[in-house]
Interface confidence: medium
Amino acid sequence: GPAKSPYQLVLQHSRLRGRQHGPNVCAVQKVIGTNRKYFTNCKQWYQRKICGKSTVISYECCPGYEKVPGEKGCPAALPLSNLYETLGVVGSTTTQLYTDRTEKLRPEMEGPGSFTIFAPSNEAWASLPAEVLDSLVSNVNIELLNALRYHMVGRRVLTDELKHGMTLTSMYQNSNIQIHHYPNGIVTVNCARLLKADHHATNGVVHLIDKVISTITNNIQQIIEIEDTFETLRAAVAASGLNTMLEGNGQYTLLAPTNEAFEKIPSETLNRILGDPEALRDLLNNHILKSAMCAEAIVAGLSVETLEGTTLEVGCSGDMLTINGKAIISNKDILATNGVIHYIDELLIPDSAKTLFELAAESDVSTAIDLFRQAGLGNHLSGSERLTLLAPLNSVFKDGTPPIDAHTRNLLRNHIIKDQLASKYLYHGQTLETLGGKKLRVFVYRNSLCIENSCIAAHDKRGRYGTLFTMDRVLTPPMGTVMDVLKGDNRFSMLVAAIQSAGLTETLNREGVYTVFAPTNEAFRALPPRERSRLLGDAKELANILKYHIGDEILVSGGIGALVRLKSLQGDKLEVSLKNNVVSVNKEPVAEPDIMATNGVVHVITNVLQPPANRPQERGDELADSALEIFKQASAFSRASQRSVRLAPVYQKLLERMKH
């Protein structure tokens, strides 16, 4: 058969939950402390909550059925009677009463024909303000007749025909009634919720609703024009040219900011947006949803997309509607011919209308922002240059911030990219130019995206002119080649000598992508004599070992994930892992990761790595090979300085350093 409507699916679920109580029994959730009842869907059934309020489950006859004394459940179909009688069956006795008062209407309801009545519940009539009720029943009940006729359609309409966004023609001056049928199974009629649907009558069908509905005469734009509370919104809509859309056909939800909402915004922020056509359009579009959303349709958190493209979380807490968790809706369900308006008393400013400074102020990077401002870079954060700000998280500065000196200023300038980027378009090997004139590289890993040593820690925030990338550490631009880095740091003097003697200087000076696990002088000194001799006595072996310390791609710590097997220039793979923020290579911790170079990255280690081939065969017995002899002689001789041993000068240097 045809696919079931959401309402029918929910009803089916309620029937399923009630079947242990007998045939045609439906489980109903009632919000504690209210008379609000809902047929239950799966999610609500397990959560036992509606709009954050606890519910109790009760079991009632499903629509169209009734109990039989002495029998289980609701085995009997309700007897069919005319529409007037059926109003009583569904409990809409006040509608019956008012029907009687009109004199003309009861004969219609009892006579031939086919009609649909959206009958307000007794509570709905009772909740009408006294002056509204008085106006309905005065004027020889003409108003009452008109009001009731507006609740009627001149044919039978069942819920499976009630489609989302459709309009029905009422029996009052052919005025439209708006129908919305939501994915959660809730059906609304002019934003009144269907409580009991599809009660058949001999001459039609009755649907019980939770409000008295009235005709809709104005479009959204006209309502904005009429209401004093929308003075600022009115001006903004006019300036943006959105009035054409808001008075046209369609079905929208306008989350309409009141004057009070605009007044909550600091003057400069507001005036900047109102004076910028693009930002203004984005601001207003962020208050418009692509379809009509009645308050009654919200029974739990729901993600909705605005015309601007931002996702809002619309939810409810008891009787209050919430947006992004805040109860800012002051007046709900104002119906327009082209949608529905909810008054809100807080402005929803999208990222796309914000300056970099505003984006950053709302993120976990406020410490970095203060540094940028103190360094005199504030204009870049609030201006109209197309920029990307690489802002380290506050946690990066938990041990304090650097003093604002020339070095810090320069470092901060290198955290601002001269283009407005989006991380989804970044690619591996891409270079980005900073305000400080540096070229930064992009590294794309399986689970992270890094710029030099710093990786993106949160989704981009794209503002009016600038984009904010939240970074996991302070970015250090490369200052030279790997060889320059090693030569410039006296911890690596022995490594530098070894690289030179192994003929790898050229490799580590030229363009390339290397990850170098750099053993410190202490690492070399800690080598057992046998290892030391094997390393130093054979240039080929030395080169082999050193190549095992060099990966053939750039791997910064943020790109490691849990475990990466990195191919070395020697051929074997290095096992690089990250646990508790500590990088390890072959299970040995890295002392200092991520020293960036133009052709790679250096990770400082305090041990010399052994290729797999060297590990199993290793024997601890005494060895008297020529290299060891040379090493011993050189050690002794360099102390005594007596005779010349034929050693390459770099080895000589190495030996000298090993003694210290």
Epitope: E263, P266, E268, G275, A361, G378
Partner: antibody, heavy 120, light 113 residues
């Protein structure tokens, strides 16, 4: 370093006019919001007027609205305050002030002030 | 308009001792969107122009000694001087830059005992 030098103050009769000028140096003038703030003798500070970096947004205190006009000339790195229909209560030291950046905010740098006396 | 009220109006302090002054606004200066307080503090030394001390309610302007600190949120703010020095004398003003018209407090005059 940043320098703001006001000029144009003096003695004027009630109903008269004066034009204050402020010469700015040591920074990119066109990048900053600028303000006039005044201080009546022995009294506190009172914000008078604001002009945005591009001159688009202009705001006045109610007490001077319709009588004073703030303007700027980025080519000359100068800020102006045209004061018409002067009253005795306009007597004050007028400070030319630079904002923190092109984002309207607090008053970061102040000139030394120029004195305006309105008296018959 | 947002009204700024400072207290005390006069604050005599012994050098080396701490000092504290208060500023209250008639409406909240905390912008929920960025959790910033739109409040600044200034010092006007005798015969001089005012100078900026604190912005965002608590961020010290560069070059301002760390004995000055701003605190508070919403409508109640405090400026503290941990150890008053002779050069700190003058009138201290708080100012809101949340909404136009921007307004100042009437000032607290700090003097040496």
């Amino acid at each position: 370093q940043v320098q703001l030098v006001e000029s144009g103050g003096g003695l004027v009769k009630p109903g008269g006019s004066l034009r204050l000028s402020c010469a700015a140096s040591g920074f990119t003038f066109s990048d900053y919001y600028m303000y006039w703030i005044r201080q009546a003798p022995g009294k506190g500070l009172e914000w008078v007027a604001t002009i945005s970096d591009g001159g688009i947004y202009i705001y006045y205190a109610d007490s001077v609205k319709g009588r004073f006009t703030i303007s700027r000339d980025s080519a000359k790195n100068s800020l102006y305050l045209q004061m018409n229909s002067l009253r005795a209560e306009d007597t004050a030291v007028y400070y030319c002030v630079r904002g923190w950046d092109r984002y309207d905010s607090w008053f970061a740098c102040w000139g030394q002030g120029t004195t305006v006396t309105v008296s018959s | 308009d947002i009204v700024m009220t400072q207290s005390p109006l006069s604050l005599p302090v012994t050098p080396g001792e701490p000092a504290s002054m208060s500023c209250r606004s008639s409406q909240s200066l905390l912008y929920s969107s960025n959790q910033k307080n739109y409040l600044a503090w200034y010092l006007q030394k005798p015969g001089q122009s005012p100078q900026l001390l604190i912005y965002w309610g608590s961020t010290r302007e560069s070059g301002v000694p760390d004995r000055f600190s701003g605190s508070g949120s919403g409508t109640d703010f405090t400026l503290k001087i941990s150890r008053v020095e002779a050069e700190d004398v003058g009138v201290y003003y708080c100012q809101q830059y949340y909404r136009y018209p921007y307004t100042f407090g009437q000032g607290t005059k700090l003097e040496i005992k």
